[in-house]
Structure formats: C-alpha cells, structure tokens
C-alpha cells in the first residue's frame, strides 16, 4: 500500500468565509463518502476548515432548463500546495471537485510542469454520484520518488469546452547532494597549475564542497557549490575527489587520478618485416606514452659491419602507424636499428637495438670490352667480354644476360640468353641474314640484373660475303659502331 509520505505540507493560504452553499455542502458531504480505493486522499480539508474556490479558471454553468437558477462556478477544491519528502519514499496526492450531474463525460487529466502525464502513471479517478452532484477525486501516487519527480503538478478538467485547472501541488524531493559536475581525470605537466571543478545540487540547498587529495582534505572550510580547486602543481600522481554536504548528508564524487606527464617509455619489439638490397621495413610496439600523446618517432640506423664507419642515420617519422621503411641503405650490409618516440615532454630512450641485414644488390657496372664477330661458318655470332669489377655489395656473380636484337627491312626482334658466371664468351645463332645484330650484356647476381653494356652492332651479310672482322664496345664518347662485313 502507498503510505502517506508527507514530511511537510504547506496549504495555500485560504480566504475566510463560507463557500457558496452547494459547494460547501458538497465539500462536507464528500468527506463522508466511502472511497472505493480504500485510501483516505492525502491532505483533504476537514469540513470545518475554511476554504475558497479557485477563481482563476472556472466554468460558469449556463441557466438550467428546469428554471432560471444559476449554478455556482466550478472549481477544484484546495489541497496541499507543497509536499517535501525524501528520495525513495512513496507519495500520494489528489484533486477533488464536485460537478453538477447535468454535466456528462467529465475527465480529469494530470499535468506536470506544463506537460500532460500520459501512460504508465499511477493516476486513479473515482466518482461519487449524489442527487445533484458527483464528487470526483483524482489521485496521483508515486512509488519511491526520485529527483526527476520534482515539479509542479496540476489537474485539468474539461467541461463544455471549458477547462478547469487546479492549484498546483509542488513536489520537492529532497536527498543527498547530487553531482552535476565531477572532477575529471587529467594529465598535467609537472609543477604546473591546473583546475578541478565540482558541482552538486540538492534539494535541500545549500550544498557545500570539501576537496580531498590522496584521502586528505584540502580545504579546512567548505566552499559553496560549485567549487573550483586550483592546484598549484604536482610532482607526482595524485587522486582527487570532492565531498558534497547538505542537510541530508554527504555524497563523495568518484576519485580521479591526476597523472604527471613524463617522457614515454622506449618502444619494444622492433621487428624486421622485409629486407631488400637498399631498404629494410621495420615495425615496433610503442611504449607507454607518459600520459601525453606521441608526436613522432625517430628510427636510428647504425652501421655495424666490423669495417664499417659506423655512420648513424636518423629518420624521423610519424608516431603512427608503427612501421617505417628505411631506405638509402647499402646492399649486403649489417645494421643495428633502434626506435625512439617523443611526446610533448621529450624523447623516450631508444628501444633495444636489433640487427638487420640488407640483401645483395644488383651489379652497378656492366661487363667490359664487349666484342662481337661472325664466325667462319657464318651460322653463329661469337661474343666475348671481360668480367666487370663489381662492388662486393652486389654479391656473387651468378651469370650474364645477353640481349641481341635483329633488325632488317621490316623485321625487329629481341632475344635474351643467360650464361653462367664462369663464361666470358658466348655463341648465338644467326637469326636473320642481311640484317644488323645489336648485342648488349649485363652481369647478374642474386640481387638482380645490372646495367647493360653499350650496344655493339654487327652486320650479318647475305650468304657469299667473306669478311670476319669483329665489332667491339666503343671507346667512351664514340658513336655506336656498326661493322659491315
């Protein structure tokens, strides 16, 4: 059952003097009626209590058909004006009105703060008919009130397109202070001032604030809500909270951690994803950011071959993604790689260094002294060359690639041959007579194909010619040789 939950009731002031006869009678007789719900309506006036009708919004009935007697204006009877109660208590309040029986289809609706209360609200309307009038009691109950139930409640009744409105009933739900703004976790610079804000509301007001740092009160005297705490600076992490006090008791905010920004921890797990002759793709796992977002990272690359200079290359990159392709590296070299990242405070230490190697590169020079001549049988072209002076970074020579292009009137075709690294000569079959054969040779390592030599051209005559003089790589700056045989 809903119990009476009135901690304090304040009726609106009532004017002395009797009510107009019929309403006064109705009022008196109403109290003696049984209540179908079984509950005594909250704060009903006793028969001896003086009262007045609400005159702000009344329905004036017309002359009745039975005679010329005017009916009194209709108005809701006065009830309690202000109910104060604690959170989670139950409350019931009502409106009552006596309506002459000449009116049909009267309905009462409840409104809160100007909005009609529809749906699943505990509103009950009871009708008590008599000879001339019907007493109507509209009850509204709230179980376990919350702050959101605070507000001004009124009843409305529509009769003959007229609207009758009751006096408002103010519901004030009081409880422990309720935070509307709590301090927020922050990351702050060491020894730099910052502010924390705390705001709490009642009712009841006032609400007073105490600040707590690491379980100790900061202010001796409370501050009225809202309160801003200026912390002059911290050297180490601290936890702050605020206490909000009112007459109902105390509420403590969440504790918030104030972190001191620091340089980041070094990245970890630097990994090699891919190596080529001149680049290495790495990734890393960022360290702890020191309570300040990463700004960028630095990839440090150090030559570590025993005979290397030890040159250090530093590549700056964005903090995300945690990957970087290191370029401009030497082929077939060993490197030590570390990563460091920075935030607004500074650079982290370098990650643990990892060793990485580049692969063999392609040769950077072409074979030397390429010569081409037609052999005695005239069925083959002999090609000779000298091994190039490849740099060690190119790795081991695995062979040579020979390109020979055959051109005659309307025909041009390129063929490629591969020969082993121990060769310094090759024979190719004549593809077309009365044509020019252009030969180029490139050295090949595991790292790839090097540059081709300058082209050497030889003319392959029609059958019956005799000359076998060779063509050879030109001296630098000369035009491509063409030997007509």
């Amino acid at each position: 059952a809903i119990t009476e939950a009135r901690e304090e009731a304040k009726p609106y002031p009532l004017f002395p003097g009797p009510l107009p006869g019929s309403l006064q009678t109705d009022h008196t007789s109403l109290l003696s009626l049984p209540h179908t719900s079984g509950y005594q309506p909250a704060l009903m006036f006793s028969p001896t209590q003086p009262g007045r009708p609400y005159t702000g919004n009344v329905a004036i009935p017309r002359v009745t058909s039975a005679g010329s007697k005017l009916l009194p204006p209709l108005a809701f009877k006065h009830t309690v004006g202000h109910i104060i109660l604690s959170e989670h208590k139950d409350v019931k309040f009502n409106c009552s009105i006596s309506v002459p029986n000449i009116y049909q289809d009267t309905t009462i609706s409840w409104w809160k703060d100007g909005k009609e209360l529809l749906g699943a609200h505990h509103a009950i309307t009871q009708f008590y008919p008599d000879d001339e009038v019907t007493a109507i009691i509209a009850s509204f109950s709230i179980t376990s009130v919350q702050r959101s139930d605070n507000g001004s409640y009124i009843c409305k009744m529509k009769i003959n397109n007229e609207e009758i409105v009751s006096d408002p009933i103010y519901i004030e739900v009081q409880g422990l202070p309720h935070f509307t703004k709590q301090p927020e976790s922050m990351n702050v610079t060491r020894n730099t001032a910052f502010n924390l804000t705390c705001q709490a509301v009642g009712p009841p007001e006032p609400v007073n604030i105490f600040w707590v740092q690491n379980s100790s009160r900061v202010n001796e005297q409370p501050e009225k809500s809202p309160s801003v705490l200026t912390v002059p600076g911290l050297t180490e992490m601290a936890v702050f909270s605020c206490e909000a006090h009112n007459d109902k008791g105390l509420t403590v905010s969440k504790g918030v951690q104030i972190n001191i920004k620091a340089i980041p921890s070094p990245p970890t797990e630097v990994s090699i994803h891919n190596s080529t002759a001149h680049s290495i793709l790495i990734s890393w796992v960022p360290g702890f950011d020191g309570y300040s977002p990463f700004r960028n990272c630095s990839v440090q690359v150090k030559e570590v071959d025993p005979l290397s200079n030890g040159s250090v290359m530093i590549f700056n990159t964005s903090a995300s993604p945690h990957m970087y392709q290191i370029k401009q590296l030497q082929a077939l070299a060993n490197y030590s790689i570390g990563v460091s990242c920075m935030n607004e405070i500074g650079w982290s230490a370098v990650s643990p260094w990892i060793l990485a190697s580049t692969t063999e590169g392609a040769p950077s020079v072409a074979p030397l002294n390429v010569t081409v001549f037609l052999n005695e049988s005239r069925d083959n072209v002999d090609i000779r060359w000298m091994k190039p002076l490849t740099k060690r970074q190119a790795g081991e020579l695995v062979g040579y690639r020979i390109s020979h292009v055959w051109q005659s009137a309307g025909i041009s075709k390129e063929l490629l041959e591969e020969v082993g690294q121990n060769n310094s000569r090759a024979q190719i079959s004549v593809q077309v007579h009365n044509a020019t054969c252009t030969v180029r040779i490139a050295a090949v390592t595991k790292g790839g194909v090097g540059p081709f030599s300058d082209p050497v051209k030889i003319f392959i005559p029609a059958h019956g010619w005799v000359d076998h003089a060779p063509s050879s790589t030109p001296a630098p700056g000369n035009a491509d040789p063409v030997l007509i045989i």
């Epitope: 150090k302 071959d305 025993p306 005979l307 290397s308 200079n309 030890g310 250090v312 370098v350 260094w353």
Partner: antibody, heavy 114, light 107 residues
Framework: QVQLQQPGAELVKPGASVKVSCKAS????????MHWVKQRPGQGLEWIGR????????NYNQKFKGKATLTVDKSSSTAYMQLSSLTSEDSAVYYC???????WGQGTLVTVSA | DIVMTQSPATLSVTPGDRVSLSCRAS??????LNWYQQKSHESPRLLIK???QSISGIPSRFSGSGSGSDFTLSINSVEPEDVGVYYC?????????FGAGTKLELK
C-alpha cells in the same frame, strides 16, 4: 680536418690503472665507431675493441675483456680506454682509430714500471 | 678467432719494382679485408679496404685483389717512401685480427 689527439705517454706503476684519452675533432663525434688498437714495441697490431659514441654500444676482443673498459664523453668529444691491473705485458702503444680505420691517433705509449 | 698469415715476412726491393704481398685467412672472409702501411714511428695508414677498394689520397700504384681467403696487395712501381711494414686485417668477424706483417725494405 679529422683529428684524433692522444697524449704522447703515460707512466704507471704495476697493479695500477690508467685512462688513455682520445679527443676527436673535425667530424661529428657520434657518427663513427671508435676502435682501440694495441702495439707492443717491435710487434704487430692487436684489436682491443670498439665503442660507438652515439649510444655507447661496444664490442670487445675477448682477450681484453676485464683489462680494457671503453667509454665516451659526448660533451667533450673524447673517448677513453681504461686499462686496469697493469703489468709489464700492458706496456705498449695504444691507438684510437675511426671510420673503418681510415683515421688514426698518434698513439699513447703506456709504460708500466715500478 | 680468424688467423691471418702474411708472406713473406720481409721483402727486399729495388725502386721501380712491381711487388706482391700475400695474405691468407684461416677461413673464408669474402672481401672483408683491409691493408695498412706503417712506417717507422708512425701510426698505421689505411691503403685498401674491402680487399680491392682504393682509398682517397693513396697513390694509385697500390692495388688489392682477392676474395674468400687469399688476398694480394700489389705495388706497381715501388718508391723509396713505400718502405715500412704492411699489415692485412680480417674485417669479417670479431675479434678483428691482423696479420703479423710484411716488412718492405730497399735492397
């Protein structure tokens, strides 16, 4: 131009320690490995170890571990080699060298004598 | 450790001679080999790196060759100032090791 300056000589007593310095100039100190090499009178060359001033990374010849300790002072662009528990066997010229042995100091003659 | 063996221990030459100094590694070191010249009372001087790469400022009469474990330093036409001790050095793996040296002297 690149210069590696070493004191000409150090005279120390047996059992004592000595810290040989090598002051670098004419290049970025933190860019190259610094090697240390020992040469006993009339003998060949022995590699002691190397240190990288960028991060104090070191590699030692196992033979000299416990005998030599390599350090750097970036603020003065100086590399140091400390030799401990000295005996007559440690009497030698000690060279510092950088850039894949392209540049050498003049050497410091350490004489261990009572 | 890799042992570097140099031969001959001493080489007597006449100015203008072409000479070859040999260096053999106890294991394959690819071309990770340096050659140094050390004159009396001086610091060593790098002549050739990575077996055959010339060094800026070194006279062109000095050249290096070889790969794997056998290496040669050649002096095309010996000059009197070339007198000194020549060392080869393993640069393949730690510890870095030097040969005992070849002493070049004038006849």
């Amino acid at each position: 131009q690149v210069q590696l300056q070493q004191p000409g000589a150090e005279l120390v007593k047996p059992g004592a320690s000595v810290k040989v310095s090598c002051k670098a100039s004419g290049y970025t100190f933190t860019s190259y490995w610094m090697h240390w090499v020992k040469q006993r009178p009339g003998q060949g060359l022995e590699w002691i170890g190397r240190i990288h001033p960028f991060d104090s990374d070191t590699n030692y010849n196992q033979k000299f571990k416990g005998k030599a300790t390599l350090t750097v002072d970036k603020s003065s662009s100086t590399a140091y080699m400390q030799l401990s528990s000295l005996t007559s066997e440690d009497s030698a010229v000690y060279y510092c060298s950088i850039a894949g042995f392209a540049y050498w100091g003049q050497g410091t003659l350490v004489t261990v004598s009572a | 450790d890799i042992v570097m063996t140099q031969s001959p221990a001493t080489l007597s030459v006449t100015p203008g001679d072409r000479v070859s100094l040999s260096c053999r590694a106890s294991q394959i070191i690819s071309d990770y080999l340096n050659w140094y010249q050390q004159k009396s009372h001086e610091s060593p001087r790098l002549l050739i790196k990575y077996a055959s790469q010339s060094i800026s400022g070194i006279p062109s009469r000095f050249s290096g060759s070889g790969s794997g474990s056998d290496f040669t330093l050649s002096i095309n036409s010996v000059e009197p100032e070339d007198v000194g001790v020549y060392y080869c050095q393993n640069g393949h793996s730690f510890p870095l090791t030097f040969g005992a040296g070849t002493k070049l002297e004038l006849k």
